[in-house]
Structure formats: C-alpha cells, structure tokens
C-alpha cells in the first residue's frame, strides 16, 4: 500500500437505497500519486460490466485523494442494479469492488422488489 | 485532526428508545462511512451498523428490528435509536468513522465513548 | 455471520519480549479483510493495522499484521510499557462486521 499504484476505494458489499427522481452522486475514492489515471464507471449485466459511455461524470479533489463521481440527475427506477470504476494506469485496468444501488421507485413502490429480496435473489437487479 | 463525541442521556427505562447522536468535528461528514459500535461492561466489541453521508445504511441482522441510524450533514452529525431497550442493552456507545483508505470497513478514528444503562 | 476467535486470551509477557496473537476466523476472509485495535481501560479502541498487514496512521513499526484466508497474526516486536492492553481483531470481508473477544496482555 505504500507504493505509487492506483487505488480505488470503493468498499466491499456497499450499498445504497435511494428514491427515484432524487439525484445522487455515486463516489469512486481513487488514490493516485502523480498523474491522474483515466476511470471510468460500467453497470453490471450479469457477469459483464457494460460501460457508461454518455453520462454526466465530475472528479473532486482533495487534499490526499479524488472521487470520480457518476452523477443521476435524477435517478430513475432502471438505475437499480451494481456497478464498478475502472482505472487504466501504466497499461493495467485496476477495477474497484462493486457497489449497488436499490431503487425505490415511489409510484410504483409496492411493485417492486424490496431490498431485502434483491439481497436474498440478485438476479431481480437485472430483470 | 478529526474528532467525534457522542451525546444522549445515560440512563434509559427498558422498553424505551436509547438516542444518541455523534458530532464530528475537525472534518467534513462527507464522503464517508460512519458508524456505531458498543461494548457491554466488561465484554468485546459489537458492531451495530453504518451510515453513509448520503443517508444510506446498513445495519446487524442481529438489531435491525429495532435500529435507526440517521445523518444530518448540515450539522455534521449522525445519530442513532435503538427501540425496545433491555438490561442487554446496557453498554458503552461508541461512533466510530470508517477508514477511506481501503475497500474494507475498518474504524480509524472513535469518539469517547458514552455509557447508557437500561435500568428502571 | 463471520465469528473471530483470539488466542490466548490473556498473554503475560515481560517489557522488551516478542509478543504473538492469534486471530482465527470462522470461514475465509481473504488476505486482507483484517483489522487490529487496541484498547486501554477507559479509552476508546485504536485503529492498529488494517487490510491485514498495513499499519494505520501514526503506529509505531514494532507493530505488525500477517496471515491471509482464516489465521491471523498481530506481532508486537519488543513490548513497551504502553503496549500492555487489550487487542481485539475485527473482520470486515462480510457484513455484519464481527470483532474477536480480545487478547489482554498483561505484565508478567
């Protein structure tokens, strides 16, 4: 850990619960010591990652780290499901822990999966 | 350098609601974890759950039932109930943040501590 | 959930001796999913070691994390009057967050 390679912080089973039409900013905590590395975020699809190519993304810096933000503006119900950071550095892809974001969609709420069952059966995040 | 100080009443009547509430100062509550942990008298270490500064939680299975964690960033402080008391619940509260230096869940700064005692 | 077993429970060692603790988990944590912390009477734990070898801010070098998979190490290198308190190690590969029941050491 004390070496120069890029880090990426996001940690292990996190998750966030959130409401549809609310924004949010989803955090990539990335340690880097001199030039910052190119990340991205991608959406898991079952065992593939699909990169999110056109939305609106910002860096914010701080003293001893940067966040590489994904931004919902606002957040809509199929935003539910995992997702990933990836940075490219020196040639190699470090990619970060997954992290989930159930959606409660409050016009429909008692349609949807709860969080406890998307817990207990994953595959609800794809259907 | 960073500091948290929890703060609520001492003793709590079984059956009641145990409130707390952690400020923390020297630093922002933003873009970190923050999390409650408590220690009977004379016994280990007891996770009770976390709260991101966007408000989203996760609590142990063992007292979901009866926790709420909250956050209120305007005043850089988190807080938590615990419904239903009894005598088991009699321990050191302590708020504790989780390290931003890892993808684990470690706790690199604590308040004090505050003891609450279930008793009538 | 994770349960963490420390070993022994009480340690009685000499100041300048090697001190050794034991952290078993009950399934795998992988090779990093390990803290240590130390706790005084009356005080708050400390953050010693984090991701199973890295030491946190501020802690001397006399003190060191090993081990990976489901046995874990804290090695204090030569005791000092300060070091003589208890140790609790936590895991945080799987939620619930799970702490041992704690090593004291004590002065012999």
């Known amino acids: 850990k004390e070496s120069c390679d890029v880090q990426l912080y996001i940690k292990r089973q996190s998750e966030h619960s959130i409401l549809a039409g609310d924004p949010f900013e989803l955090e990539c905590p990335v340690k880097y010591c001199a030039n910052r590395p190119h990340v991205t975020w991608c959406k898991l699809n079952g065992t593939t990652c699909v990169k999110l190519e056109d939305r609106q993304t910002s860096w914010k810096e701080e003293k001893n780290i940067s966040f590489f933000i994904l931004h919902f503006e606002p957040v809509l119900p199929n935003d539910n499901g995992s997702y990933r950071c990836s940075a490219n550095f020196q040639s190699n892809l470090i990619e970060s822990h997954s992290t989930t974001l159930y959606v409660t969609d409050v016009k429909s709420a008692s349609e949807r999966p709860s969080k406890d069952e998307m817990a207990s059966r994953p595959w609800l995040l794809y259907r | 350098q960073v500091q948290l100080q929890e703060s609520g009443p001492g003793l709590v009547k079984p059956s009641e609601t145990l409130s707390l509430t952690c400020t923390v100062s020297?630093?922002?509550?933003?873009?970190?974890?923050w999390s409650w942990i408590r220690q009977p008298p004379g016994k280990g270490l007891e996770w009770i759950g976390y709260i991101y500064y966007s408000g989203s939680t996760n609590y142990n299975p063992s007292l979901k039932s009866r926790i709420t964690i909250s956050v209120d960033t305007s005043k850089n402080q988190f807080s938590l109930k615990l419904s239903s008391v009894t005598a088991a619940d009699t321990a050191v509260y302590y708020c504790?943040?989780?390290?931003?230096?890892?993808?684990?869940?470690?706790?690199?700064?604590w308040g004090q501590g505050t003891l609450v005692t279930v008793s009538s | 959930e994770i349960v963490m077993t420390q070993s022994p429970a009480t340690l009685s060692l000499s100041p300048g001796e090697r001190a050794t603790l034991s952290c078993r988990a009950s399934?795998?944590?992988?090779?990093?999913?390990l803290s240590w912390y130390q706790q005084k009477p009356g005080q708050a734990p400390r953050l010693l070691i984090y991701d199973a070898s890295t030491r946190a801010t501020g802690i001397p070098a006399r003190f060191s994390g090993s081990g990976s998979g489901t046995d874990f190490t804290l090695t204090i290198s030569s005791l000092q009057p300060e070091d003589f308190a208890v140790y609790y190690c936590q895991q945080d590969y799987n939620l619930p967050l799970t702490f041992g029941g704690g090593t004291k050491v004590e002065i012999k």
């Open positions: 504790a943040r989780v390290i931003l230096y890892s993808s684990g869940w470690s706790f690199d700064y």
């Open positions: 020297g630093g922002s509550i933003s873009s970190y974890y």
């Open positions: 399934q795998s944590v992988s090779s990093s999913y």
